[in-house]
């Protein structure tokens, strides 16, 4: 069985790599435009040059193409705490990231917000903060992990998950009280 190809893929597959089929004449293969440029005019005939023009400021193409327009440069989302790591060039989109001691939390595949890495106060760092993952903390005795922060077991309510983690602490308190009653 032949896999189903889209019209553009079908047209491109007729030509060798780095070339595309002329939209008005399927017997002509035109050379694709280099990254940083876009297609202004198709090649007039076989072996003749494709008219490619450089992308204007604020736009780019990151790979060889036969796009009629360059792509608009991305803008870093300040409201998400993003900062510009590298600015847009004709052949590369803007690279956005987070500040030092922050990590990216992806709200969707394409959208991230910067959050501060947890410091693991009253605990130790189990796994260091990564570009896309917060620090993983291990809490000291007498503390339990809640929302990636080490909270005192004195704040542990019976209904919360922490009862298991804080149980030895609770039993120790009871044991001390019991041993005092002779």
């Amino acid at each position: 069985l032949v896999p189903h190809l889209g019209d553009r893929e079908k047209r491109d597959s007729v030509c060798p790599q780095g070339k595309y089929i002329h939209p008005q004449n399927n017997s002509i293969c035109c050379t694709k435009c280099h990254k940083g440029t876009y297609l202004y005019n198709d090649c007039p005939g076989p072996g003749q040059d494709t008219d490619c023009r450089e992308c204007e400021s604020g736009s780019f193409t990151a790979s060889e193409n036969h796009l009629r327009h360059c792509l608009s440069c991305s803008k870093c989302r300040k409201e998400m705490g993003q900062v510009e790591i590298s600015s847009c060039t004709v052949d590369r989109d803007t690279v956005c990231g987070c500040r030092k001691n922050q990590y990216r939390h992806y709200w969707s595949e394409n959208l991230f917000q910067c959050f501060n890495c947890s410091l693991c106060l009253n605990g130790t760092v189990h796994l260091s903060c990564q570009e896309k993952q917060n620090t993983v903390c291990t809490c000291h005795a007498g503390f339990f992990l809640r929302e990636n922060e080490c909270v005192s077991c004195s704040n542990c309510k019976k209904s919360l998950e922490c009862t298991k983690l804080c149980l030895p602490q609770i039993e120790n308190v009871k044991g001390t009280e019991d041993s005092g009653t002779t």
């Epitope: 939390h105 709200w107 969707s108 595949e109 959208l111 990636n148």
Partner: nanobody, 122 residues
Framework: EVQLLESGGGLVQPGGSLRLSCAAS????????MAWVRQAPGKGLEWVSF????????YYADSVKGRFTISRDNSKNTLYLQMNSLRAEDTAVYYC???????????????WGQGTLVTVSS
């Protein structure tokens, strides 16, 4: 079939409060990030607030920071938006949306509710 059903909208005076709810079904609600998005009359969509699957991390638009609170109850498959100190400019249709996690093709949301109208007027 994924369904998101908003409720709690209505007419409220400036300075008043409302609590919106969104009942989710047809997917594992507790495994996904959720959002509130609004559209004011004659305007484009505006992100209001996001919340992660566990209800720990949140995002708020500058226009609602300190006034709105997003929360969720995974045991009830419900998303909430507590809106306090409401202003005329908060008048909009409020949509509950599921944030897209894969094969998004530049979309940030893959499912939407029908919306609930919030009108802030004296």
């Amino acid at each position: 079939e994924v369904q998101l059903l908003e409720s709690g909208g209505g007419l409220v005076q400036p300075g008043g409060s409302l609590r919106l709810s969104c009942a989710a079904s047809g997917f594992t609600f507790g495994g996904y990030r959720m959002a509130w998005v609004r559209q004011a009359p004659g305007k484009g969509l505006e992100w209001v607030s996001f919340i992660d699957s566990e209800g720990v991390l949140t995002y708020y638009a500058d226009s609602v920071k300190g006034r709105f609170t997003i929360s969720r109850d995974n045991s009830k498959n419900t998303l909430y938006l507590q809106m306090n100190s409401l202003r005329a400019e908060d008048t909009a249709v409020y949509y509950c949306a599921k944030l897209c996690s894969s094969n998004c093709n530049m979309r940030n949301f893959d499912y939407w509710g029908q919306g609930t109208l919030v009108t802030v007027s004296s």
